[in-house]
């Protein structure tokens, strides 16, 4: 009678993560008597995957009933496959021996490859905000995919970026891989509503790439422009001075009025108006009673935006240009929440 052969008909099997892998094996004879075992890998470090008679293998089921007297089908199914299951699986026939069973013949092996989807890309920007014309870096990470081949692209508002560097790790063979990419983006004043998108394409995604996004509103700081103007005379001894704070982002802003270098009032931007580009405008005003002043007044609008060093704009108010009420040194009453009189 011909010597027993162990046949593994599939040289390779490709399975998606989470699915069940079927590893086929048949023997050509019932002799010698002894069990079949499945191993991953060869040599002394091989891992036992299934032993017909002993051990706990909750993920493995047999395709046929191994207890049937004439059974020669030793195929197995392994459930809930993960990338860690990738490798070459050997169906090995043992013959009964004493004290231990002795390896008799091995199949040629079946290579199990696992396709695993990449995790959703996570995009992160710089820790601190930056101003227009500056270049900032964004990183994109995705993990757990297999095989190694993967494509990553960067977009800003739908326009593909070219200034980026990408690494896939590890370089050698692994059960699964990770991708890390860093893109450089030049900020503009219009970027409050902009998005940076990292797009990952992989064979497991069937042409439907995964995307991770970052809003540049989290990254950009648009500093304000200031304009101090003197409004027409409201009454013969009153002047309305306004400070226009324009095109700033984010909203966090504190304004201080100084009169001849002395703090007059400090307020925080509240009822701002939003521009189409996402930046904000705000206006503060002072009602100045010029009759309270003998000399010219230097009014300064000082703005601290988003914790940055203060910027300021000044306006010289000519007291001599306005007639004074004789004997009066009383300022006009406050007439609005944003109004303040200078004494």
């Amino acid at each position: 009678e011909e010597e027993l052969q162990v046949i593994q008909p599939d040289k390779s099997v490709l399975v998606a993560a989470g699915e069940t892998a079927t590893l086929r094996c048949t023997a050509t004879s019932l002799i010698p008597v002894g069990p079949i075992q499945w191993f991953r890998g060869a040599g002394p470090g091989r891992e036992l995957i299934y032993n017909q008679k002993e051990g706990h293998f909750p993920r493995v089921t047999t395709v046929s009933d191994l207890t049937k007297r004439n059974n020669m089908d030793f195929s197995i199914r392994i459930g809930n496959i993960t990338p860690a299951d990738a490798g070459t699986y050997y169906c090995v026939k043992f013959r009964k021996g004493s004290p231990d069973d002795v390896e008799f013949k091995s199949g040629a092996g079946t290579e199990l490859s696992v396709r695993a989807k990449p995790s959703a890309p996570v995009v992160s920007g710089p820790a601190a905000r930056a101003t227009p014309q500056h270049t900032v870096s964004f990183t994109c990470e995705s993990h757990g995919f297999s095989p190694r081949d993967i494509t990553l692209k960067w977009f800003k508002n739908g326009n593909e970026l070219s200034d980026f560097q990408t690494n896939v790790d590890p370089v050698g063979e692994s059960v699964s891989y990770s991708i890390h990419s860093t893109a450089k983006v030049v900020l503009t004043r219009e970027d409050v509503h902009s998005q940076v998108i990292c797009e990952v394409a992989h064979v497991t995604l069937q042409g439907d790439p995964l995307r991770g996004t970052a809003n540049l509103s989290e990254t950009i700081r648009v500093p304000p422009t200031l304009e101090v103007t003197q409004q027409p005379v409201r009454a013969e001894n009153q002047v309305n001075v306004t400070c226009q704070v324009r095109k700033f982002y984010p909203q966090r802003l504190q304004l201080t009025w100084l009169e001849n270098g002395n703090v007059s009032r400090t307020e925080t931007a509240s009822t701002v108006t939003e521009n189409k580009d996402g930046t904000y405008n705000w206006m503060s005003w002072l009602l100045v009673n010029v009759s309270a002043h003998r000399d010219d007044v230097k009014l300064t609008c000082q703005v601290e935006h988003d914790g940055q060093p203060a910027v300021s704009k000044s306006h010289d108010l000519k007291v001599s240009a306005h007639p004074k009420e004789q004997g009066s040194n009383t300022a006009a009453e406050n007439t609005g929440s944003n109004e303040r009189n200078i004494y």
């Epitope: 008597v33 002394p44 470090g45 091989r46 891992e47 036992l48 017909q52 008679k53 002993e54 051990g55 706990h56 293998f57 009933d65 191994l66 207890t67 009964k96 004290p99 231990d100």
Partner: antibody, heavy 114, light 108 residues
């Protein structure tokens, strides 16, 4: 569900024999080995031997080789362990254990005393 | 035969503490064949970890196993009062199958 139900406690004299039974249900009896493990009071676990119910092939711990016999009756899905020439140090709880090492019998206390 | 030596014999720790139990084999054991059991008084042993590092069904993930060759470890990351028991390692790599002498874990 899988169950291994063992026979009741036994008290034996030194030199006598004891036969403990283990009735299996809830799985294909011939699928896996059936082991016997014992535990003396306050002591560790000691593997005595195993049987393959499919063909009655046995393996024994050399320590018990001459005194232990493990058998099966596949018609009743029952495994047996017989220990002869009992001595006081054989006083222990005897467990039958399915080959997957997950399913254990409830244990049978054997007391050897003169 | 392969002799499995467990240490320490007794471990007395407080709830929330980390327990590290050692099992040393007299000759190399393939990690696929190294199992751990938990046994409480009056009960049969219960399979805790199989193939060195895999948690058996229903076992909380505070239990973990590691090792290779001759040195194996069972770790309980944060002890709970119900973890008070005796823990045994076991090899079925070669005949005769053997068990370690056990480590008793006491909760203070």
């Amino acid at each position: 569900q899988v169950q291994l139900v063992q026979s009741g406690a036994e008290v034996k004299k030194p030199g006598a024999s004891v036969k403990v039974s283990c009735k299996a249900s809830g799985f294909n009896f011939e699928d896996t080995y059936m082991h016997w493990v014992r535990q003396a009071p306050g002591q560790g676990l000691e593997w005595m031997g195993r049987i393959d119910p499919a063909d009655a092939d046995t393996k024994y711990n050399p320590k018990f080789q001459d005194r232990v016999t493990i058998t099966v009756d596949t018609s009743t899905n029952t495994a047996y362990m017989e220990l002869s020439s009992l001595r006081s140090e054989d006083t222990a709880v005897y467990y039958c254990v399915r080959g997957n090492y997950v399913n254990w019998g409830q244990g049978t206390t054997v007391t050897v005393s003169s | 035969e392969i002799v499995l030596t467990q240490s320490p014999g007794t471990l007395s720790l407080s709830p929330g503490e980390r327990a590290t139990l050692s099992c040393r084999a007299s000759s190399s054991v393939s990690s696929s064949y190294l199992y751990w059991y938990q046994q409480k008084p009056g009960q049969a042993p219960r399979l805790l970890i199989y193939s060195t590092s895999n948690l058996a069904s229903g076992i909380p993930d505070r239990f973990s196993g590691s090792g290779s060759g001759t040195d194996y470890t069972l770790t309980i990351s944060r002890l709970e009062p119900e973890d008070a028991a005796v823990y045994f390692c076991h090899q079925w790599y070669s005949y005769p199958r053997t068990f370690g002498g056990g480590t008793k874990v006491e909760i203070k």
